[in-house]
């Protein structure tokens, strides 16, 4: 987190705000809806409480406005700049406002104006970006989905280092974000993408370009808001230009950053048995054409040039790839060998001596 | 509906540059990922770059570091950025919106020579 210079703060624990205007994209109550819970997102964590008035000026002054809107702080139509809001202080300080030129929604569809109304607020609160991809005070904006919105810890700590913690979190869950080189790291999934590799751990993943230490982490929703914040397993088909990820009984196939027409499609359509509830690995071989999907102490083996299950299959885990244990979180390929991933401990496996070479730390696929 | 109409590509000798664009008519354009593919004489067609909705953008191996995508949803228009340009570029470049199953323009020849 990172707060103003100077430590811009509120010297009072009970503010006030005022909805100036309204966008013509929602109804009035949505908006008092949204904002009303953009304020609560803080005040369950500290010890501010936030009431609203009807006219007279209030500490943050909420409006809606376009292009040049009084503040020398102009607009830009839409998307680019959403809104802003000041820190902390008389006047404008933690006024905020927000471009009228946006489609404000309280759905995933345009801006959702709550999500973004919460950041805005840490901001007239005393907080500034965050270079923590997984916090709500990260500059790029990110549908994060229509489950109950939990604020990440990284915020928690910024506004507590400001005003200190409230009486009794009533959501005392607060998501952390992935640290790569922790030594009990394990993975979710692995796949190739266009010569990256993308390795995803709860709602994130890190992009690991080739010749590369330094992987960048993003939120998996920021790549493609349409899918699940988590996934199970994941694979690439080179030629095809696709990659396939796989969430419970469902899986998608994306093209880049964009879902196939007919996605999702339920994982029994592969040929999987209706008892599979979830893949939780997947590697393609694409010389052989052939996809190992893992389940539990299982393995299929999936035709993906004929679409069918290959017969024999499913198998024991254990005796296909002896010594890697009866799970797999997480796979790839490279070189002729496969990286099996269970908990923090990664399995080199040579394909040609089919046996073990190497065990490494899960998180040495990140250099650490 | 999106139509997309890409600038006219050109000839260049290798280590030079050249900038495509690729403008979009339909308001719809800011919705979609906008992706560059090109397709060299007896090969398939492959892709080359992309950038999201959100401006996170992606690079096929050969072309990283040396090509850069951008967008300008205002305006509706996509941009190629293309420098250190090698005799392997040589192909008729196509721009995308929304991916495999999307819309394509017609496609813009460039050449590269030693």
């Known amino acids: 987190y990172n707060v103003f210079p100077r430590t811009l703060k509120w010297s009072k624990m009970n503010l006030t705000y005022r909805i100036v205007n309204y966008t013509p994209d929602m109804t009035h109550s949505e908006v008092e809806k949204a904002f009303k819970k953009a304020f609560k997102v803080w005040s369950d964590v500290t010890p501010l409480n936030f009431t609203r008035l009807h006219d007279g000026i209030a500490d943050i002054m909420i409006s809606f406005g376009i292009k040049e809107h009084g503040d020398f702080y102009p607009f830009d139509g839409p998307s680019g700049l959403l809104a802003h809001a000041f820190p902390p202080g008389p006047n404008y300080g933690g006024d905020a406002h927000f471009d009228d030129d946006e489609t404000w929604t309280s759905s995933s569809k345009g801006y959702n104006l709550f999500l973004v109304a919460a950041h805005e607020f840490g901001h007239s609160l005393g907080l500034d970006h965050s270079k923590d991809p997984g916090a709500l005070m990260f500059p790029i904006y990110t549908y994060t989905g229509k489950s109950h919105f939990m604020l990440p810890d990284d915020d928690v700590q910024g506004i507590q280092s400001l005003y200190g913690p409230g009486d009794e979190d009533p959501n005392p869950k607060h998501p952390k974000t992935p640290d790569k080189c922790d030594p009990s790291l394990s993975l979710d999934a692995i796949t190739s993408l266009r010569g990256e590799t993308m390795i995803f751990k709860d709602r994130f993943f890190w992009r690991l370009h080739p010749q590369q230490v330094d992987a960048e982490l993003f939120l998996t929703k920021s790549f493609w808001p349409e899918l699940p914040n988590r996934i199970d397993a994941a694979y690439e088909h080179p030629s095809h230009d696709l990659i396939f990820i796989f969430r419970g009984r469902k899986f998608w196939a994306l093209n880049g950053y964009d879902i196939l027409e007919g996605y999702p499609k339920k994982i029994s359509e592969l040929g999987l048995p209706k008892e599979v509830k979830k893949i939780s690995a997947a590697v393609h071989f694409e010389d052989t054409g052939k996809t190992l999907l893992f389940s539990g102490n299982q393995v299929w083996r999936y035709d993906d040039t004929n679409h069918i299950m290959d017969k024999d299959y499913p198998r024991l885990i254990e005796e296909d790839f002896p010594g890697i244990g009866d799970k797999v979180d997480a796979v790839y390929e490279k070189n002729g060998y496969i990286y099996f991933f269970n908990g923090p401990i990664q399995f080199e496996y040579s394909i040609w001596s089919n046996r073990i070479v190497r065990v490494m730390p899960a998180n040495s696929i990140l250099w650490c | 509906e999106v139509q997309l109409v890409e600038s006219e590509g050109g000839s260049v000798q290798a280590g030079g540059s050249l900038r495509l664009s690729c403008a979009a008519s339909g308001s719809t354009f800011s919705r979609y990922s906008m992706n560059w593919y090109r397709q060299a004489p007896g090969k398939q067609r492959e892709f080359v770059a992309g950038?999201?909705?959100?401006?996170?953008?992606n690079y096929a191996v050969s072309v990283r570091g040396r090509f850069t995508i951008s967008r300008d949803n205002a305006e509706g228009t996509g941009y190629l950025q293309m420098n250190s340009l090698k005799p392997e570029d040589t192909a008729v470049y196509y721009c995308?919106?929304?991916?495999?199953?999307?819309?394509w323009g017609l496609g813009t020849q460039v050449t590269v020579s030693s």
């Open positions: 950038i999201s909705v959100g401006r996170i953008t």
């Open positions: 995308n919106a929304g991916g495999l199953q999307g819309y």
